[in-house]
Amino acid sequence: QPDAINAAVTCCYNFTNRKISVQRLASYRRITSSKCPKEAVIFKTIVAKEICADPKQKWVQDSMDHLDKQTQTPKT
């Protein structure tokens, strides 16, 4: 679960230890602030929950790629 350290900065202190299918993910954002202890990815899931994930993990990278492609594909 991400933590807001102030109004502008949200940090992750722990990562999910379980892979989530990309079908359950809606969007993501990267956390790169120097105010945070570690770089992270926050996924927003289909049920609007925010989950912290480790950007070094392959499933996280694959999921970000998939979500990027989804947003690039115009809906017909």
Epitope: K19, V47, I51
Partner: antibody
Amino acid sequence: QVQLVQSGAEVKKPGSSVKVSCKASGGTFSHYGISWVRQAPGQGLEWMGGIIHIFHTANYAQKFQGRVTITADESTSTAYMELSSLRSEDTAVYYCARYDAHYGELDFWGQGTLVTVSS
Amino acid sequence: EIVLTQSPATLSLSPGERATLSCRASQHVSDAYLAWYQQKPGQAPRLLIYDASDRAEGVPARFSGSGSGTDFTLTISSLEPEDFAVYYCHQYIHLHSFTFGQGTKVEIK
């Protein structure tokens, strides 16, 4: 500890409807769903459908489409399964089971409700 | 709809023996979203394994799951008297379309 408590056994006439309830306690309701699974005497498990609470819409197995209605009342943490146009083949134990919408395995189950359809 | 086929239908073994149960899917089960349940007579099913190989809380180490794609296995390394039951596999790739296998009964030889 999460607990799912279902309503009691029912005896119904062919052609009628039955509504089974499933009350959840001891856990968060928001990003979880409830599935309904039935088991006819001596048979295997059959998924009927499910509902994710914050979506307020249910999904149904094709076999039950049009005959089953699954609803949830977040204020009372209770899910309901209504099956209409009952026939003798609907005699079964009906289970509710909880799942996390991020995954899907059924981690907690109700005790089951026996529905007998007989004229 | 993904169809799950379990084999064998019945497995007759003695306590202490190893049980190997198979579950084959008609389509690729992405993300290994497959679970195994144990059901004893008159009881609700109990989750044993999720994500193909992760043991649920409180499940003894003699139960293990493996597999990916279309072929999955539940192994009970050494059967205890309380393990004689029916076992079901379940896929949960799509939240709108879960399916179960037809079950494997593990009975005492």
